[in-house]
């Protein structure tokens, strides 16, 4: 008698390893013999697909070599025209030993930056990833973390992070190890001990001592007044990534000696500089403070403006303060080529004394800003017209670079000599007699925003502030 199909062995979940065989059995009782079709994720499996073998009148489906992409829901459907079609479904779970698909690579990184060592894995169950540094498991902390992807992220890389690393991927089926990679931490050249300035008698022997560190170990060169040291003996030693250089000098003239530590990072170099002065008798000694240091002005642009042998402040927020500050002045001076002969010398004096601020001794030598009164004299008397143009250009964003903005002081942010005559520097170039000022052309604006102070006569050493000038 005809009999509708009944699936006597329902499909079950099958676990299979990659590259192994997986078989689903769909035993059917019926009369006449049914037609059995198979689907994966509701898509019909074609009889001629060579990745599959369908036997026993369609009751056995074999995946000949399981791939990672084969997982899904497999269903068999039996139909013999008697009654309705019947269906049974089961899942194929592809199990996979851990496999590292993107292993870590050797990394060179500069101290303080972020390092990421990749370790992307495959596997089912999903492998857990851990890392080994040297021979020990790597502990995570606030800086070091294993990301969800398995990659190792190290924030603010430190010297002690250098070493050999490998990642380990583990699941219930096995463990995979990456090859060992090297994390090399490079450190910018840094001066540990700067040479000290000396005030000595003529003919003395002085040893300047400079110690630097970095990875790779830096080289040290000595510069005397801007040129390679021509005399004196240099002794060097290297121990534990620290280079120690001693320059012995026979002193017959004062000089500025700079120790330059240099090391290479790929195609780039990092340098650190420290300077000391050798002075004879009353020559001044520049000392370092935490924002920069004092040194004799050795540039060209401000030669005519700054006093001979002026000690100026070099700002160490620039990698090369002398060069950077000189470039600032140079850029600003180019803008001055078009200003009036009345404005130009005053503006040049202002720029040079603002960018290369006079050094003032004290607890530590520090830069001394220009007095507000002199700044205002330039802004509202000597260069009133030009200043208005510059402010307009700045407002409209017409300058090619913004470097000149650093060159022009904001007068209101400068100290007044009225409250502390030692808080700021005068501009000797503006110490004209009041008689001379009467010959200056009238201002463009009807009245300056503040009254211009009386500038001292050249014979006077003190600065008399006009009674009306009381801007605080």
């Amino acid at each position: 008698l005809p009999k509708a199909p009944v699936i006597t062995t329902p499909l079950e979940t099958v676990d299979a390893l990659v590259e192994e065989v997986a078989t689903f059995m769909c035993a059917v009782e019926s009369y006449p013999q049914p037609e059995i079709s198979w689907t994966r994720n509701k898509i019909l499996i074609k009889l001629f697909d060579t990745r599959y073998s369908i036997r026993e009148n369609g009751q056995l489906l074999t995946i000949l070599s399981v791939e990672d992409s084969d997982d899904g829901i497999y269903c068999c459907t039996a139909n013999n025209g008697v009654g309705g079609a019947v269906e049974s479904c089961g899942a194929l779970q592809v199990k996979m030993k851990p496999k590292i698909t993107r292993p870590p690579i050797n990394v060179k990184i500069i101290e303080g930056l972020k390092a990421v060592l990749p370790c992307t894995t495959m596997g089912n169950p999903k492998p857990s990833v851990s890392w080994i540094k040297g021979d020990s498991p790597l502990r995570e902390n606030s800086r070091i973390a294993v990301l969800e992807s398995g990659s190792l992220r190290i924030h603010n890389v430190q010297k002690e992070d250098a070493g050999q690393y490998r990642c380990v991927a583990k699941n219930s089926l096995g463990t995979a190890y990456s090859k060992v990679v090297k994390l090399e931490v490079e450190v910018f050249a840094r001066i540990l001990r700067a040479p000290e300035s000396h005030n000595v008698t003529f003919g003395s022997f002085v040893t300047l001592h400079c110690t630097a560190t970095g990875i790779p170990v830096p080289t040290i060169t000595w510069i005397e007044n801007g040129n390679a040291v021509s005399s004196g003996s240099i002794q060097e030693s290297v121990k534990d990534r620290v280079i120690d250089s001693r320059l012995q000098l026979f002193i017959t003239k004062p000089g500025l000696y700079t120790c330059i530590a240099t090391n290479k990072h790929g195609e780039k170099f990092s340098t650190a500089k420290a300077a000391a002065t050798i002075s004879i008798a009353e020559w001044s000694k520049p000392q370092k403070d935490n924002k920069g240091y004092c040194a004799q002005y050795r540039g060209e642009v401000c030669n005519a403006v700054l006093a001979k042998d002026a000690l100026v402040f070099l700002n160490t927020s620039y990698a090369d303060p002398e060069e950077a500050q000189e470039l600032l002045v140079h850029t600003a001076w180019n803008e001055l080529k078009v200003v009036s002969p009345v404005c130009r010398p005053a503006a040049e004096a202002l720029l040079c004394n603002h960018i290369f601020q006079e050094c003032s001794p004290g607890v530590v030598p520090t830069p001394i800003p220009i007095c507000r009164e002199y700044c205002l004299a330039v802004k509202e008397l000597f260069c009133a017209k030009e200043w208005l143009v510059m402010e307009e250009k700045t407002h409209r964003g017409l300058y090619r670079s913004e470097m000149h903005l650093l060159s022009v002081p904001e007068c209101s942010k400068l100290p007044s000599m009225h409250w502390d005559p030692t808080a700021c520097a005068r501009l000797p170039h503006l110490d004209y007699n009041k008689e001379n000022l009467k010959t200056f052309p009238p201002m463009t604006s009807s009245k300056p925003s503040v009254d211009i102070p009386n500038l001292p006569s050249s014979s006077s050493s003190s600065f008399s502030v006009s009674p009306t000038y009381s801007m605080t």
């Epitope: 000694k285 000690l311 003032s360 007044s416 030692t422």
Partner: antibody
Framework: EVQLVESGGGLVQPGGSLSLSCVAS????????MNWVRQAPGKGLEWLSV???????YYADSVKGRFTISRDNVKNTLYLQLNNLKPEDTALYYC?????????WGQGTQVTVSS | DIVMTQSPSSVTASVGEKVTINCKSS????????????LNWYQQRPGQSPRLLIY???TQESGIPDRFSGSGSTTDFTLTISSVQPEDAAVYYC????????FGSGTRLEIK
């Protein structure tokens, strides 16, 4: 006219702490170096500390580690925190405006350290 | 630290007399770059706060009478009161500002 008004002085036991304040007016406080100077009874002047326009502080060796100078440019106020006070810290404490010279002085606030 | 030594420790003068007070520093207080002497003079009248008289060794602070003048260089400095007045009775201090500030021990001026 520059005015510097100190406050916060008083009697304190050895090992104790005190916080001195100096309210400044009549000038743009943030643009100037500010100092603390003290004068023990019947004695001379002793400079203690200076704070520059970037709030970088410097101290005399005698108070380094015990005293802390600070400034609040919004409130136009200079502070001196005195910790671990000793009897020899008994003095009149002056707030002073000035960089190379001590140009303007307050009237002072008396600190007495005694058990 | 630079040590400042003042002399004499006290002086008595009559009104109209000239008075000189000396101050010696243990090392030079002249800054080579600008050749300024970082030496200041102060007056402290009884019961009052000190006031600045002279800075940079010889520059008179504004509002200070012309009878007060300063001179000297390197390590030796002098404060001169050309014609002493009754209101000049005070203690006078020198102070160096070349490094961490230090004061002299003071000179007491009494008027006869």
């Amino acid at each position: 006219e520059v005015q510097l008004v100190e406050s916060g002085g008083g009697l304190v036991q050895p090992g104790g702490s005190l916080s001195l304040s100096c309210v400044a007016s009549g000038f743009t406080f943030s643009l100037y170096y500010m100092n603390w100077v003290r004068q023990a009874p019947g004695k001379g002047l002793e400079w203690l500390s200076v704070i520059d326009t970037h709030s970088i502080a410097y101290y005399a060796d005698s108070v380094k580690g015990r005293f802390t100078i600070s400034r609040d440019n919004v409130k136009n106020t200079l502070y001196l925190q005195l910790n671990n006070l000793k009897p020899e810290d008994t003095a009149l404490y002056y707030c002073v405006l000035g960089r190379t010279a001590l140009v303007r002085w307050g009237q002072g606030t008396q600190v007495t350290v005694s058990s | 630290d630079i040590v400042m030594t003042q002399s004499p420790s006290s002086v008595t003068a009559s009104v109209g007399e000239k008075v000189t007070i000396n101050c010696k520093s243990s090392q030079s207080v002249v800054f080579g770059s600008n050749q300024k002497s970082y030496l200041n003079w102060y007056q402290q009248r009884p019961g009052q706060s000190p006031r600045l008289l002279i800075y940079y060794a010889s520059t008179q602070e504004s509002g200070i009478p012309d009878r007060f003048s300063g001179s000297g260089s390197t390590t030796d400095f002098t404060l001169t009161i050309s014609s002493v007045q009754p209101e000049d009775a005070a203690v006078y201090y020198c102070q160096q500002a070349y490094s961490a500030p230090t004061f002299g021990s003071g000179t007491r001026l009494e008027i006869k």
